[in-house]
């Protein structure tokens, strides 16, 4: 069952999942100047059975430069940051070689993918938080949030994390020391 809303936002922190439960959707988003192809699902889906899960549908982006697209949307205050390198994503994915039944790993990047990945999570999903570079984690409890179903409604638990001050970024479960990823998370695996 899909979670009704997105995980909580923590100031100066990003979150990611180590693995994604079946039923999770990942929107096929493209970077500026590109758009999703007109045939094909608007999202990838983590699907499968208890023994093997994988991402169904493939996201594809095509150049929108040739099209006469009129700007009808109020522009964003800032342009999106450039995506970090695929090498860095691969480094992060090496830390993600988990094999949880009924879960998918982080899907590989697709060409001209947008900077930020937009997931629709399902009930039971856990996401983990870390402070962005330059902020120190003050923990009052687990720096994670779980989507739970109570009385027919979904809600995310509140992560017990405050990010303050100057220091190295904290780590997600199962990751190496920060030098493997000095700039924090690859953009594709963060949500702000």
């Amino acid at each position: 069952e899909l979670c009704d809303d997105d995980p909580p936002k923590i100031t100066h922190a990003t979150f990611k999942a180590v693995a994604y439960k079946e039923g999770t959707m990942l929107n096929c988003e493209c970077k500026r100047g590109f758009r999703r192809i007109k045939s094909g699902s608007p999202y990838m889906l983590c699907t499968g059975n208890s023994s093997h899960s994988s991402w169904d549908n493939q996201c594809q982006c095509t150049s929108s430069a040739a099209r006469n697209t009129t700007k009808q949307v109020t522009p964003q205050p800032e342009e999106q940051k450039e995506r970090k390198t695929t090498e860095m994503q691969s480094q992060m994915q090496l830390a993600d070689q988990v094999s949880l039944p009924g879960h998918c790993r982080e899907p590989p990047p697709w060409e001209n993918e947008a900077t930020e990945r937009i997931y629709h999570f399902v009930v039971g999903q856990t996401v983990y938080y870390q402070c962005v570079q330059g902020y120190r984690a003050l923990h009052r409890g687990p720096a994670e949030s779980v989507c739970k179903m109570t009385h027919g409604k979904t809600r995310w638990t509140q992560p017990q994390l405050i990010c303050t001050g100057e220091t190295e970024p904290s780590q997600f479960p199962g990751e190496e020391e920060p030098q493997a990823s000095p700039d924090g998370l690859p953009e594709s695996e963060t949500s702000r």
């Epitope: 959707m25 045939s39 699907t47 169904d56 964003q76 937009i118």
Partner: antibody, heavy 114, light 107 residues
Framework: QVQLQQSGAELVRPGTSVKMSCKAA????????IGWIKQRPGHGLEWIGD????????NYNEKFKGKATLTADTFSSTAYMQLSSLTSEDSAIYYC???????WGQGTLVTVSS | DNVLTQSQKFMSTSVGDRVSVTCKAS??????VAWYQQKPGQSPKALIY???YRYSGVPDRFTGSGSGTDFTLTISNVQSEDLAEYFC?????????FGGGTKLEMK
């Protein structure tokens, strides 16, 4: 709580235009496409088009090109649909949808009558 | 355009019954199909996405199945509140299209 609040019913003259709104709350507006659907008794549901508020993108059903114009204002988290050169065929309930069709507005009834 | 056909416009049922609403696509859509429930005077409500996954708050008596061109929404142990119109939708390719609807009525 995710909500899509649509503007009120409209009674309009043939040949004129109407602009309706859909205000989103409870999720990140710029992350998801907003779709627009037409429903007329005996005609079922028709997909008009969609707009990505976080970019410059719109998609239209060929049938509604020139009839519908979709826009969005990211600062007020509101999507708009304008219908032009109205005829009795445009009398219908129009719905906006968000978060991959998971949520629907309450609908805006448009009645075209002289 | 990909035409979705719901061959039965009306289906009669009784409380406690099991009923299956079918939807056939003119072109392969994989599993990119959703099901909606609409009660008189209300907006459609999303029940199923990706052919077989339930949205939150949807009772587990609603089950979606199928892939390719043939899809089914099954309601087991029908309740009186399930009497409504049911629509299928494909979102595999633009323009997205809907089935004509199937109205569930009491015998």
């Amino acid at each position: 709580q995710v909500q899509l609040q649509q503007s009120g019913a409209e009674l309009v003259r043939p040949g004129t235009s109407v602009k309706m709104s859909c205000k989103a709350a409870g999720y990140t507006f710029t992350n998801y496409w907003i779709g627009w659907i037409k429903q007329r008794p005996g005609h079922g549901l028709e997909w008009i088009g969609d707009i990505h508020p976080g970019g410059d993108y719109t998609n239209y059903n060929e049938k509604f090109k020139g009839k519908a114009t979709l826009t969005a204002d990211t600062f007020s988290s509101t999507a708009y649909m304008q219908l032009s050169s109205l005829t009795s065929e445009d009398s219908a309930i129009y719905y906006c949808t968000g978060r991959n069709f998971a949520y629907w507005g309450q609908g805006t009834l448009v009645t075209v009558s002289s | 355009d990909n035409v979705l056909t719901q061959s039965q416009k009306f289906m009669s049922t009784s409380v406690g019954d099991r009923v299956s609403v079918t939807c056939k696509a003119s072109q392969n859509v994989g599993t990119n199909v959703a099901w909606y429930q609409q009660k008189p005077g209300q907006s459609p409500k999303a029940l199923i996405y990706s052919a077989s996954y339930r949205y939150s708050g949807v009772p587990d008596r609603f089950t979606g199945s199928g892939s390719g061109t043939d899809f089914t929404l099954t309601i087991s142990n029908v309740q009186s509140e399930d009497l409504a119109e049911y629509f299928c939708q494909q979102y595999n390719s633009y323009p997205y299209t809907f089935g004509g609807g199937t109205k569930l009525e009491m015998k």
